[in-house]
């Protein structure tokens, strides 16, 4: 077989699959957590019913040097239609409470599981 350079582009991941993969990654993080996640870093809590994916990314992107959540950050960047940079907060983001990354991940996971059960893949 001859390699013609590059890889065949995989088909787009259906929203249901993308959501399931994110849930699996968050489960992985919570189950493998030994020491405090991201050294106990604090992030802004978000309204999980309002523009959740971009808001979650805007919060988590401010955590740097934490390999445990890098894959989650990458996945969430694909879930948001606009580019998110550290220090950026959209109008959907209410910055009033900070919580530990571990708690943020647990809250996000519970909400995503609920959405998945209800078949809300949008």
């Amino acid at each position: 077989l001859t390699c013609l350079g590059g890889f065949a582009s995989p088909g787009p991941v259906p929203p249901s699959t993308a959501l399931r993969e994110l849930i699996e990654e968050l489960v992985n993080i919570t189950q493998n957590q030994k020491a405090p996640l991201c050294n106990g870093s604090m992030v802004w809590s978000i309204n999980l019913t309002a523009g959740m994916y971009c808001a979650a990314l805007e919060s988590l992107i401010n955590v740097s040097g934490c390999s445990a959540i890098e894959k989650t950050q990458r996945m969430l960047s694909g879930f948001c239609p606009h580019k998110v940079s550290a220090g950026q907060f959209s109008s959907l983001h209410v910055r009033d409470t900070k919580i530990e990354v571990a708690q943020f991940v647990k809250d996000l996971l519970l909400h995503l599981k609920k959405l998945f059960r209800e078949g809300q893949f949008n």
Partner: antibody, heavy 118, light 109 residues
């Protein structure tokens, strides 16, 4: 002033490949996702996909994923859309557009008309 | 894949009010669909009116407003002007891709 200037109209035969460029000015392309939209004559808008020019990461609409390739050159602030295996139903105007939260799809290229005809 | 449906055409009197809706085949539209509304006139590129469900673009007149209404995204035009006659499209984000609506032709008559 923000501007997106696209390459000129193309007339191509079925089976050919087209490459459309979108040269931006007034902003740095790597700071934004660039989206591409198709509009066939007298028809509605159809989202093709988007690219993060900073790392080349792409998302494609299911309809286009096997024939379209989005790329970007951050050194020249230019985004590209390549569509292969052209067929008559690909005859359309193709737009590039900048997307960010505070002005999604606020800036559009002038459109590039691609005509596929034998 | 989801289908996003709009009313094919609507007519409004000058000064009147009309509401355009954007329905998702997969269920209720939410703020995580980041609904966008566009106006397009013949021979022109689309122009964003509303983004993120209910935020007006800087150039959007106050007579246009966006909302969620009965599980659909909605665009309300209050006090229609002759220049508002155009095609209107919505676009919804589905986790990793946009889908545009079928479009609504608004006639001001």
């Amino acid at each position: 002033e923000v501007q997106l200037v696209q390459s000129g109209a193309e007339v191509l035969k079925p089976g050919a490949t087209v490459l459309i460029s979108c040269k931006v000015s007034g902003f740095t392309i790597k700071d934004y996702y660039m989206h591409w939209v198709q509009q066939a004559p007298g028809k509605g808008l159809e989202w093709i996909g988007r690219i993060d020019p900073e790392d080349g990461e792409t998302k494609y609409a299911p309809k286009f994923h096997d024939r379209v390739t989005l790329t970007a050159d951050t050194s020249t602030d230019t985004a590209y859309m390549e569509l292969s295996s052209l067929r008559s139903e690909d005859t359309a105007v193709y737009y590039c557009t900048r997307y960010d939260y505070y002005g999604p799809f606020a800036y559009w290229g002038q459109g590039t008309l691609v005509t596929v005809s034998s | 894949q989801a289908v996003v449906t709009q009313e094919p055409s609507l007519t409004v009197s000058p000064g009147g009010t009309v509401t355009l809706t954007c329905r998702s085949s997969t269920g209720a539209v939410t703020t995580s669909n980041y609904a966008n509304w566009f106006q397009q006139k013949p021979g022109q590129a689309p122009r964003t009116l509303i983004y993120g469900t209910n935020n007006r673009a800087p150039w959007t007149p106050a007579r246009f407003s966006g909302s969620l209404l009965g599980g659909k995204a909605a665009l309300t035009l209050s006090g229609a002007q002759p220049e508002d006659e155009a095609e209107y499209y919505c676009a919804l984000w589905y986790i990793n891709h946009f889908i545009f609506g079928t479009g609504t032709k608004v006639t001001v008559l």
